[in-house]
Interface confidence: low
């Protein structure tokens, strides 16, 4: 299980990654682009009942497949720094994006990278010293490999392997919300929101203008960035004269709670600062922007509320699919629950279980969601993203079902197609009670742990739970060990 999440000490470094319904109005009342990719991989989104274009696509497909006999497909996304150099990373270097085009496809996947944030001069300086690539484009490699949902291999990405793939590196440290340039007054630029807008503008000249669907995806801070920017992208495209491009969102591990910390701590650094405190400070420091419709719901100075998924989601026009671990490591970190390899105290254990319950509650009215009961952080650009299941359905399958569903503008509960669910939230109550969760390793020994070992390590009370379930403790342990 190489490449899977390891159970590491929190607080050492922030987690970093290595991407219907309210759509923008459309000129031509056009269809969407959900297709059963798992069973028929040709991208029919480019075929509009026109046989000539279909044959051209087949020819293009044949030509593109020809080199495969001699060499492996080039999986790399290539770096393009923004031509508009006034849209910058924190240090004033030009922002950019990595692109891998797929000529036959009218689907575009734009992925926002994650990597925490900084919210004052002190912790931004420290971030610049230790994680410069998250604040500057100066040392970015020329290419990146697409993994998970950014992979062009059908085996690794049964959902959208044939899409045009765009990876937008995170170098604004502002949860993709800022719109303030570097100046004499501001040591750093915070232009996350403007970076997204500028990338979209430049991509229009590279084929995005012919897109049917633009899926704005992101993990961690990038996932929150999706919630903050998806409607603005839709508005931009409509303003620029592309109202028929359907804009959707996919927010992975960016649905945070503004809950009470397990142990209250002063807001000294990024990872110990309570979520609300960090965002309150950040939004002022970044001149952060939030979606207009959400902003209208809160009075001046209260815009920070819109950084929290369950508050901003009901105000969004574009359909958004929410992917969130019920026991998210970043959430636990900011809540001061540090699982340091020692069995947790009872108070922590109850806090963790309650977090799962609270999170489940906030997803109740989210029409499209995938929330496994695992202790982890981020998933969609992990190579193992196809392995995790909720109620027997994998994430790529759920996304495929969502693609086909075209849920309505109010996100009212619509019955999904039989056997094709896309509201998938685990109901079992503790971390890793889902047997398909990413493998856990003991951070000291590097040893893989099975579910039973992990839960006992966490202080799971086998005796009590067995009693509640009306079974022998040994039977419950056996079930857990077998992954049931």
């Amino acid at each position: 299980s190489e490449g899977r999440k390891t159970w590491r000490r929190r607080g050492q470094q922030p987690p970093q990654p290595p991407p219907p319904p309210p759509l923008p109005q459309r000129a031509e009342v056009e269809p969407g682009a959900g297709q059963p990719v798992e069973s028929f991989p040709l991208d029919f989104t480019a075929v509009e009942g026109n046989m000539d274009s279909f044959m051209a696509q087949v020819k293009s497909l044949a030509q593109s497949l020809y080199p495969c006999s001699a060499q492996q497909l080039n999986e790399d996304l290539r770096l393009h720094l923004l031509l508009n150099t006034s849209v910058t990373c924190n240090d004033g270097s030009p922002a950019g994006y990595y692109l891998k085009e797929s000529k036959g496809s009218r689907r575009w996947l734009l992925f926002l990278e994650g990597g925490w944030y900084c919210f004052n001069r002190e912790n931004c300086d420290s971030r610049y010293d230790t994680m410069r690539r998250l604040m500057s484009s100066k040392d970015w490699p020329h290419t990146r490999t697409g993994t998970g949902i950014l992979s062009s291999q059908p085996e690794e990405n049964p959902h959208w392997w044939n899409a045009n793939m765009v990876f937008i590196p995170y170098c604004s440290s502002d949860v993709w919300s800022g719109a303030s340039p570097k100046s004499d007054k501001n040591e750093y630029a915070f232009m996350g929101s403007l970076i997204i807008q500028e990338v979209v503008r430049e991509l229009l000249g590279k084929g995005l203008s012919g897109a049917k669907v633009l899926l704005l995806a992101g993990s961690s801070a990038g996932g929150t960035g999706v919630l903050l920017n998806v409607d603005r992208v839709a508005e931009l495209l409509e303003e620029l004269g592309y109202p028929s491009i359907q804009v959707r969102g996919l927010a992975d591990s960016g649905w945070f709670l503004d809950n009470k910390q397990y142990r209250r701590s002063d807001c000294i650094d990024t990872i110990n600062c309570a979520p609300t405190d960090a965002i309150r400070r950040g939004i002022r420091y970044w001149s952060g922007m939030v979606p207009e419709r959400c902003q209208r719901q809160f009075k001046e100075g209260e815009e920070w509320n819109c950084f929290f998924g369950y508050k901003v989601y009901p105000t969004l026009r574009c359909p958004v699919f929410v992917v969130q671990w019920l026991f998210d490591e970043a959430q636990l970190t900011v809540d001061n629950v540090h699982l340091t390899g020692q069995p947790v105290q009872e108070g922590q254990w109850l806090y963790i279980q309650n977090l799962g319950r609270e999170l489940r509650g906030t997803l109740k009215d989210v029409q499209a969601s995938f929330a496994p009961a695992c202790l982890s952080h981020e998933i969609i650009i992990r190579s193992y993203w196809t392995d995790v299941q909720v109620k027997g359905t994998s994430l790529p399958r759920a996304l495929h079902c969502w693609d086909r569903s075209f849920h309505d503008s109010h996100k009212a509960s619509k019955t999904p197609m039989k056997g094709c669910p896309f509201h998938l939230v685990d109901s079992c109550p503790w971390p890793h009670c889902n047997p398909s969760c990413p493998t856990i390793r003991d951070q000291f020994t590097g040893q893989e742990m099975n579910v039973a070992q992990f839960l006992m390590h966490m202080g799971f009370d086998v005796q009590t739970v067995a009693q509640q379930q009306g079974m022998e403790p040994s039977k419950l342990l056996g079930m857990l060990s077998n992954g049931n």
């Epitope: 319904p21 109005q25 459309r26 009342v29 969407g32 075209f406 503008s409």
Partner: antibody, heavy 119, light 111 residues
């Protein structure tokens, strides 16, 4: 309650003009594309015109192009249809309807306003 | 323009039985797994009311007695069991491309 209410229907002579209005309430009007549709007496439904949420896209049925103009005022939550060079075949009940974000169907309809073109 | 042919023009069904209305498009209205066909009910003196969208999705608040199916060019609206209040006119509409067009309607009578 989500509601659309049309007004402005009247009896008008052939070649005349008329402006129809549609007042929206109960939803964020500025988020939705809007349509005008019509129904001649004892006849079926016919699409007239479409305007996108920000007025960037306007579209008309062929027989109405050049004679009808669709517009909206998001601040006032109103949709309008300016009709000129009216013909007897334009006699109908005119409905405004909200376009659902996905799929192009009409999920909210007004009650209609009657336009009669006759000499 | 895509022409929708609705049949039958009128239909008489016994109370509690099944009513089936068909709609055929001159060109496919399905694409990429979606079928852009919708069904409306219109009672005299009232505007149309959305029943089914995207071929088979029941609009919220509409009784489960109504169901839709089909793809490509052939679509069906089923009402079962039929109730007295269902006696009115039904229209299909496509939104595959502009202009959206409607079928000529089916008048349902209950005996």
């Amino acid at each position: 309650e989500v509601q659309l209410v049309e007004s402005g229907g009247d009896l008008v002579k052939p070649g005349g003009s008329l402006k129809l209005s549609c007042a929206a309430s109960g939803f964020t009007f500025s988020d939705y594309g809007m349509h005008w549709l019509r129904q001649a007496p004892e006849k079926g439904l016919e699409w007239v015109a479409y305007i996108s949420s920000g007025s960037t896209t306007l579209s008309y049925a062929n027989t109405m192009k050049g004679r009808f103009t669709i517009s909206r005022d998001n601040a006032k939550k109103t949709l309008s249809l300016q009709m000129t060079s009216l013909r007897s075949e334009d006699t109908a009940i005119y409905y405004c309807a909200r376009k659902n974000y996905n799929g192009g169907y009409f999920d909210v309809w007004g009650t209609g306003t009657t336009v009669t073109v006759s000499s | 323009d895509i022409v929708l042919t609705q049949s039958p023009a009128s239909l008489v069904v016994s109370l509690g039985q099944r009513a089936t209305i068909s709609c055929r498009a001159s060109k496919s209205v399905s694409e990429s797994g979606y079928s852009y066909m919708h069904w409306y009910q219109q009672k005299p003196g009232q505007p149309p009311k959305l029943l089914i969208y995207l071929a088979s999705n029941l609009e919220s608040g509409v009784p489960a007695r109504f169901s839709g199916s089909g793809s490509g060019t052939d679509f069906t609206l089923n009402i079962h069991p039929v109730e007295e209040g269902d006696a009115t006119t039904y229209y299909c509409q496509h939104s595959r491309v502009l202009p959206p067009t409607f079928g000529s309607g089916t008048k349902l009578e209950i005996k």
